[in-house]
Interface confidence: medium
Amino acid sequence: DSSKWVFEHPETLYAWEGACVWIPCTYRALDGDLESFILFHNPEYNKNTSKFDGTRLYESTKDGKVPSEQKRVQFLGDKNKNCTLSIHPVHLNDSGQLGLRMESKTEKWMERIHLNVSERPFPPHIQLPPEIQESQEVTLTCLLNFSCYGYPIQLQWLLEGVPMRQAAVTSTSLTIKSVFTRSELKFSPQWSHHGKIVTCQLQDADGKFLSNDTVQLNVKHTPKLEIKVTPSDAIVREGDSVTMTCEVSSSNPEYTTVSWLKDGTSLKKQNTFTLNLREVTKDQSGKYCCQVSNDVGPGRSEEVFLQVQYAPEPSTVQILHSPAVEGSQVEFLCMSLANPLPTNYTWYHNGKEMQGRTEEKVHIPKILPWHAGTYSCVAENILGTGQRGPGAELDVQYPPKKVTTVIQNPMPIREGDTVTLSCNYNSSNPSVTRYEWKPHGAWEEPSLGVLKIQNVGWDNTTIACAACNSWCSWASPVALNVQYAPRDVRVRKIKPLSEIHSGNSVSLQCDFSSSHPKEVQFFWEKNGRLLGKESQLNFDSISPEDAGSYSCWVNNSIGQTASKAWTLEVLYAPRRLRVSMSPGDQVMEGKSATLTCESDANPPVSHYTWFDWNNQSLPYHSQKLRLEPVKVQHSGAYWCQGTNSVGKGRSPLSTLTVYYSPETIGRR
């Protein structure tokens, strides 16, 4: 309506004796600025005077003078918008209606505001959510319809009279819409908070109590349970009885069902608050709890660990690791179900007690072949001694041991024989799968671990074998000791160092490179004739007749070997010279006569010299002297001399007779 002044402010304000009131207020006058303002207490309109009667709490005039008693009330507004008021302190009798009489140049208005002042501070109001569940965060709100700048207050939360640790957030509102102080507390209630009293306490600035509001918490929660067990330590022996009782310490709402669980699994047909276990077995060991449900959900008790004690069960042995390699380390673990755990162990190796080993584990730092075998153990606890289980087998693997190469042949072995060797060993794990031989040869292996050497060579000295599984072990080499006839027999001239001259002392040696056996005999032969049985053949003074083809033989018990024929050459000066005449020693003049100087020489004659009956050398140097035509005066005695590198030789005289021809005789 355009004929009204427009005001905005809280409809009612609340306070208490001695506090203050702050009245937020805005207005809009119909025209012009505010010229006069009067604050009435419970104003009443007097129709006679056309004015309002009532207690004037505040009055502002054109000259701006305010009576001294009006200092309690302050107009904090202005001439056109703000009409905020403050009353400090406020009294009980201020309750009622406040009238704001506003006048402008041409218009007047009375605006009414309710003021409710109580004798004592009124309580705040706690607001709760419709339902509270355990562990779910909720916000508790404490609201007080009061706020005043001149009168500070605080709101504190208490749980069962004890300040709550959670931080609350306090907010105030002093607006034309609302005036309040509010505290909000975020809080995660537990089941134990159910039924507890929460208080919101109003305090002044010094923490002095002014008023409070309380509520009882209704915290919905699953049933809270306590489990009791007889015996109390839940440790029993097989055959004993056990009783477990489930007690509900709290449930909101009321519980509906009961059940029992073992190791998380529900036990059938157990729906009462008591669980009776009669003549328990070790299988009944485990974690027990009871479960009770209500509309919120199931609640579980703490677990009771029922230990049914029993003597150790038959033990088993675990080996880390089998098979084991000789020299490695191995650990044995004795495993036996028992309650309480075994305190003592007895270990057995191949049925024999291993003294001094009483622990759950046995450690062998360096495994040897004799550690192989069956390991078993017995566990012992306070209730008794278990039985020895089947045990575990330790397999210790190692290279073949004590490998030897064995000659199968009767001894001695002769060159050309067929030799059979075998490779033997003492023990091996795993089994031997192959064999190796040194040196390598094109030899036959007729069966595993056997070597056949056909036509064995004289120089086959040693053979070694290896027996192999995952590893190879070599035997020491074995000497074949092959026997053979002497080898590389040859004739060697010992002296003289240079060529042999007739008359020299000569020694020939019969050499051979090797013989097995070493005991030998020698034989010298020339042209099939035995000359001697020593290793040397000696000539004190060699003659040309000794020249020729020589052989030596060396024999041992295996056989004999001949050298190649060796030619003995004797060097000598020309000898046995003679002059032969052709066609004869009587030749007719005019014919041809040939004289030949025949000789025996080594090396052959290299130079001939011819002499006549006067020992005159003739100018001819070849072996043959040719006279053609021959003359009677050629008749006479001739001799020749032969020369080689060794020396000279001369022939005896040979007479040539030249006779006259018939013609010559005829002419005479």
Epitope: E353, Q355, G356, I364, K366, L368
Partner: antibody, heavy 122, light 110 residues
Framework: QVQLVESGGGVVQPGRSLRLSCAAS????????MHWVRQAPGKCLEWVAV????????YYADSVKGRFTISRDNSKNTLYLQMNSLRAEDTAVYYC???????????????WGQGTLVTVSS | QSALTQPPSVSGSPGQSITISCTGT?????????VSWYQQHPGKAPKLMIY???NRPSGVSNRFSGSKSGNTASLTISGLQAEDEADYYC??????????FGCGTKLTVL
């Protein structure tokens, strides 16, 4: 209680032989590895040899290998050490000691005899 | 097999703690947890004090303790007493299936 008593010590010329004995009582002799340990006058302890509980395996220090032989007679509860080709450096107090048990190797000696003195001198 | 290395002597006052070291190689001390310690009073047989690095036989005072790091084992005696004065030997199993001793440490209680 466990007792180990050595005997057989004395003075011997280099190159000659001597046999030590160790009589055991107070425990199951056949279940334990047995050792010989020696100590030259004023010198260190030196491990000599070990024999397994059943006599199946024997191990020797390098210094005595090939000259000394360890043996046992479980029926007589007695341990022996046959010492051949004795040298001056073999002069020592010889102790017999009980091994910790079956393991033999990685052993420790929980009981010792009082020792017997062997003097090798010409 | 070389002897294990021990200091020739150590000393301490009553109530103090001392440590004796024993150094070997990876083939003995470092390779196995089979180190033992022996106490020997003059003219007496040795007595086992620690076995398998750190275990105490029954009857041996808990003032004696053993440990090992790498190739070195140690014997510690706390709250030293006059009767602890003796020679102390360490011993170890070796990779060649033999045993080896140290050359001993003379402990003097001042």
């Amino acid at each position: 209680q466990v007792q180990l008593v050595e005997s057989g010590g004395g003075v011997v010329q280099p190159g000659r032989s001597l046999r030590l004995s160790c009589a055991a009582s107070g425990f199951t002799f056949s279940a334990y590895g047995m050792h010989w340990v020696r100590q030259a006058p004023g010198k260190c302890l030196e491990w000599v040899a070990v024999i397994l509980y059943d006599g199946s395996n024997k191990y020797y220090a390098d210094s005595v290998k090939g000259r000394f032989t360890i043996s046992r007679d479980n029926s007589k509860n007695t341990l022996y050490l046959q010492m051949n080709s004795l040298r001056a450096e073999d002069t020592a107090v010889y102790y017999c000691a009980r091994g910790s048990g079956w393991l033999q190797l990685g052993d420790y000696f929980d009981y010792w005899g009082q020792g017997t003195l062997v003097t090798v001198s010409s | 097999q070389s002897a294990l290395t021990q200091p020739p002597s150590v000393s301490g006052s009553p109530g103090q703690s001392i440590t004796i070291s024993c150094t070997g190689t990876s083939s003995d001390v470092g390779g196995y947890n089979y180190v033992s310690w022996y106490q020997q009073h003059p003219g007496k047989a040795p007595k086992l004090m620690i076995y398998e690095v750190s275990n105490r036989p029954s009857g041996v005072s808990n003032r004696f303790s053993g440990s090992k790091s790498g190739n070195t084992a140690s014997l510690t005696i706390s709250g030293l007493q006059a009767e602890d004065e003796a020679d102390y030997y360490c011993s170890s199993y070796t990779s060649s299936s033999t045993l080896v001793f140290g050359c001993g440490t003379k402990l003097t209680v001042l």
